[in-house]
């Protein structure tokens, strides 16, 4: 019986050009994690494997950094990065647990920054 639960950062937003950490945590199970896949829609971004460590997909190498922990850091965000991201925990003996994160990348503008820090 699969008793585990995945906690994620949920729905998050970040500004274009910035970076964001995608984080999932598997809890409430003593199943051992053997690998964690990070996927965007049907594309594999990265995998952290028990015996091989981290592997970042070649097409994302410049913008994806492993960690912290089993999380993933996305850098130099573009509006096209908006969408669903999935952390897939492969465990023994439970099987597979999947967590979902929705990332919205927002356009940033000088005007917005100016207004935000304006002194009255």
């Amino acid at each position: 019986m699969m008793t585990g639960t995945i906690e994620t950062t949920g729905n998050i937003s970040a500004e274009k050009g910035g970076s964001i950490i995608l984080q999932c945590h598997l809890s409430s199970t003593t199943a051992q994690v053997t690998a964690v896949n990070w996927e965007q829609q049907d594309q594999l971004l990265a995998i952290c494997n028990a015996d091989l460590g981290w592997h970042i997909s070649p097409s994302f190498k410049d913008r994806v950094a492993p960690g912290p922990g089993l999380g993933l850091t996305l850098q130099s965000l573009t509006v096209n990065d908006t969408g669903e991201y999935f952390c897939i925990y492969h465990t023994y003996p439970d099987g597979t647990y999947t967590g979902r994160i929705f990332l919205e990348v927002l356009e940033s503008s000088v005007a917005e920054h100016g207004a935000r820090f304006q002194i009255p």
Epitope: E7, Q32, A35, G69, Y92
Partner: antibody, heavy 119, light 113 residues
Framework: EVQLVESGGGLVKPGGSLKLSCAAS????????MSWVRQTPEKRLEWVAY????????YYPDTVKGRFTISRDNAKNTLYLQMSSLKSEDTAIYYC????????????WGQGTTLTVSS | DIVMSQSPSSLAVSVGEKVTMTCKSS????????????LAWYQQKPGQSPKLLIY???TRESGVPDRFTGSGSGTDFTLTISSVKAEDLAVYYC?????????FGGGTKLEIK
């Protein structure tokens, strides 16, 4: 150089409590899972507690569950083991040990701190 | 719980001899999805803490001399020291990290004649 230095051991009466500490240096502490492993007077090794890199997961064997609590302070690079309702069979050398993410063997061990539970 | 049994409990050999010690688990330590055996070997010299020698049953830890070799799969594992040195005087433990709770064998004490 990886260093793990345990402290806090001593003589405790049955039913008593004690908190052990492990100061880590020479590596990025928050990137590693950690465990406490003890060695009994008969030289047997027993794993007693595990905590994940960020502290969100903890596991214990049935022998100590409900009596021992593992925790960590990543800002201070320190691992802790709070022990309560101590029994004579908890007498041992307690080691803190490092684990690489997703690999559950112990790649570095501290020098150990001794707990004696006796009246 | 997975029970780990080591044999012999002790042995005495002369410098230069080959040594073999065994470790048996009560259930398979082979994980089918990655074909890895979740078994480690440790060396504990007198007055010291344990030191990792071998993981994944056969992968030597960095800095460990190549006279130490781990082998085996499933439930039967072996640690071999091809040519014993005086500094190998120690107790050797196997550990399974296949499933909770992680468990150790009782150890094999290597003595030098």
């Amino acid at each position: 150089e990886v260093q793990l230095v345990e402290s806090g051991g001593g003589l405790v009466k049955p039913g008593g409590s004690l908190k052990l500490s492990c100061a880590a240096s020479g590596f990025a502490f928050s990137d590693y899972d950690m465990s406490w492993v003890r060695q009994t007077p008969e030289k047997r090794l027993e794993w007693v507690a595990y905590i994940s890199d960020g502290g969100y997961n903890t596991y214990y064997p049935d022998t100590v569950k409900g009596r021992f609590t593992i925790s960590r302070d990543n800002a201070k690079n320190t691992l802790y083991l709070q022990m309560s309702s101590l029994k004579s069979e908890d007498t041992a050398i307690y080691y803190c040990a490092r684990q690489i993410l997703l690999r559950y063997y112990f790649d570095y061990w501290g020098q150990g701190t001794t707990l004696t539970v006796s009246s | 719980d997975i029970v780990m049994s080591q044999s012999p409990s002790s042995l005495a050999v002369s410098v230069g001899e080959k040594v073999t010690m065994t470790c048996k688990s009560s259930q398979s330590l082979l994980y089918s999805s990655n074909q890895k055996n979740y078994l480690a070997w440790y060396q504990q010299k007198p007055g010291q803490s344990p030191k990792l020698l071998i993981y994944w049953a056969s992968t030597r830890e960095s800095g460990v001399p190549d006279r130490f070799t781990g082998s085996g799969s499933g439930t039967d594992f072996t640690l071999t020291i091809s040519s014993v040195k005086a500094e190998d005087l120690a107790v050797y433990y196997c550990q399974q990290y296949h499933s909770y709770p992680w468990t150790f064998g009782g150890g094999t004490k290597l003595e030098i004649k």
